[in-house]
């Protein structure tokens, strides 16, 4: 009797050994062991995920499962032939042995053998269709990650040269808040300034306001004795002109009139005749001192004596005080025409000022004091203004109330320093002011962080050294 | 009133540091830029380096770039200098200024380089 026997070799594939008489017949079936079952927990809506599965494993995985459908097919290839080649041999053994049982287990080796490759088969199939659909899920995640990233990378440009642009504002905003920093400082300065000086005058009015008030009592107290006085001086006048009407003497009412040969100003310079610019001497009413004073006949309606002019840097202006005084340089170019002269004249009329300024950049300012005059060498030439207006700030640069006149060997400012020896030049400074128009001439490109250079604060700042400066005198009636 | 008193003076070796110090009082110190100011025996006022009202920006002349570091303590209206790898051209009076329009100024501080 036929023995039949099914066990698992060393490598695990299934053994199928089937013993006929001497015969034995061994089948050897690869086992799909690194395939899962249709039991496995490995079903087919596992990939059904919000991350997809390591692309790789997936191809790995797939690469297998085709080698080994492959290595199945061949092994069936070679089981059919070798069942082919082993059943003719069995058919003639039969036919010749008759052994009919023989037959009937070979039909059931054979039909076992079907089944199997055929579940083998149909088990192949459905891992397929499993790695297939996993494949097309996992191709189209990838679709839709390569998309994302796409997008996402469009949005990350897009955000770059946005940022990009910023920066070129940011840099470009920061630039402008710095420049507006220093103005800004200066506005501020400019307004406390102005609100100091307002307190000043304020206090200065009320104690004007007060004196007022008292000379008003005081008027109305005298009204009555100046009103018996006018009558008493009315009847003089009166018996005065009986007198005159009365009296025989005659008197000759012709006086010879002297023509004018001197000036006094530019004004009257103008006023004569000669409105050219230049040179001219002028001479103080009884006086016989002359200088000689350049005369702008042109700017403003003309009739203007020029007091100080800085053009090139040609004249020293670090002088002592008697150079001041007199006066130095060249009225035709740069000079200063002399503190007691100009004392002397806007002490007897009222004089305007003008101070006209330009910088290094062709731009031009100036500075107009409606009422300008010096006081004596006694009070060391202070200055005096009012009423300023004009282009070249809208306060004052030569401090208020007005400073007592310095030079290097008379310091009579009111710092802790010599104003004069440290900033140079003879100029009406504070501690030390606002203003030196008669400072160092600094030429182009050397005329910033200079602080002893040509200074009119209100204007450039306290660094900036000017290009040039001239200083006007005119009679406020002019 | 208004004052700017320098210290921190003296005399010190080529390649020496001094720091100078600037006390201000009588006006709004955090308000104004601050420089220092130097004046060489025989010479014109020379511009050292100059700090805005914050403390953020600084400027220097060529001559003390990378040698010489402006700075201000505005909580006790103080502005310094210190001054590192020193050279006999360095001797001269420092002024400390406020960039006010009065341009308010110190009786300065001597320094004198030598060996």
């Known amino acids: 009797y036929n023995n039949f026997r099914k066990s698992m070799d060393s490598i695990g594939k299934k053994q199928y050994q089937v013993q006929h008489g001497s015969c034995s017949y061994t089948f050897l079936l690869p086992e799909m062991d690194n395939c899962r079952s249709s039991s496995s927990p490995y079903v087919s809506n596992a990939v059904q995920r919000d991350a997809p599965l390591e692309y790789d494993d997936s191809v790995q995985r797939l690469q297998v499962l085709e080698n080994i459908m492959e290595n199945n097919t061949q092994w069936l290839m070679k089981l059919e032939n070798y069942i082919q080649d082993n059943m003719k041999k069995e058919m003639v053994e039969i036919q010749q042995n008759a052994v009919q049982n023989q037959t009937a287990v070979m039909i059931e080796i054979g039909t076992n053998l079907l089944n199997q490759t055929a579940e083998q088969t149909r088990k192949l199939t459905d891992v397929e269709a499993q790695v297939l659909n996993q494949t097309t899920r996992l191709e189209l995640q990838l679709l839709e990650h390569s998309l994302s990233t796409n997008k996402l990378e469009k949005q990350i440009l897009d955000q770059t040269s946005e940022i990009n642009k910023l920066q070129d504002k940011n840099s470009f905003l920061e630039k402008k808040v710095l420049a507006m920093e220093d103005k800004h400082i200066i506005q501020l300065q400019s307004i406390k300034e102005e609100k100091d000086q307002l307190q000043v005058l304020v206090s200065k009015q009320n104690s004007i306001i007060e004196e007022l008030e008292k000379k008003i009592v005081t008027a109305t107290v005298n009204n009555s004795v100046l009103q018996k006085q006018q009558h008493d001086l009315m009847e003089t006048v009166n018996n005065l002109l009986t007198m005159m009407s009365t009296s025989n003497s005659a008197k000759d009412p012709t006086v010879a009139k002297g023509e004018q040969i001197s000036f006094r100003d530019c004004a009257e310079v103008f006023k004569s005749g000669h409105t050219t610019n230049g040179v001219y001497t002028l001479t103080l009413p009884n006086s016989t001192e002359e200088v000689k004073a350049y005369c702008d006949m042109e700017a403003g309606g003309g009739g203007w004596t020029i007091i100080q002019r800085r053009e090139d840097g040609s004249v020293d202006f670090q002088r002592t005080w008697k150079e001041y005084k007199v006066g130095f340089g060249n009225p035709s170019g740069e000079y200063w025409l002399g503190n007691e002269f100009v004392s002397q004249l806007t002490n007897q009329q009222r004089y305007v000022l003008k101070i006209h300024l330009k910088d290094w950049e062709g731009n031009e300012a100036y500075s107009l004091y409606e009422h300008f005059y010096l006081s004596s060498e006694e009070l060391n030439y202070r200055i005096h203004l009012k009423g300023l207006t004009g282009t070249a700030g809208k306060i004052s640069s030569i401090s208020q109330p007005g400073n007592d006149f310095s030079t290097k060997d008379a310091d009579n400012d009111k710092c802790i320093c010599k104003c004069s020896q440290m900033l140079t030049g003879g100029w009406w400074f504070d501690a030390c002011g606002p203003s030196n128009l008669n400072g160092m001439y600094y030429p182009q490109r050397q005329n910033t962080n200079k602080f002893n250079g040509i200074k009119w604060y209100y204007w450039k700042g306290s660094g900036y050294s000017l290009k040039g400066t001239t200083m006007m005198i005119r009679p406020a009636g002019f | 009133e208004v004052q700017l008193v320098e210290s921190g003076g003296g005399l010190v070796q080529p390649g020496g540091s001094l720091r100078l110090s600037c006390a201000a009082s009588?006006?709004?110190?955090?308000?104004?830029?601050m420089s220092w100011v130097r004046q060489a025996p025989g010479k014109g006022l020379e511009w050292v380096s100059t700090?805005?009202?914050?403390?953020?920006?600084?400027g220097y002349a060529d001559s003390v770039k990378g040698r010489f570091t402006i700075s201000r303590d505005n909580s006790k209206n103080t502005l310094y200098l210190q001054m590192n790898s020193l050279r006999p051209e360095d001797t001269a009076v420092y002024y400390c200024?406020?960039?006010?329009?009065?341009?308010?100024w110190g009786q300065g501080t001597t320094v004198t380089v030598s060996s």
């Open positions: 200024n406020a960039d006010h329009p009065q341009g308010y």
């Open positions: 700090i805005n009202s914050g403390g953020g920006r600084t």
């Open positions: 009588g006006f709004t110190f955090s308000s104004y830029a």
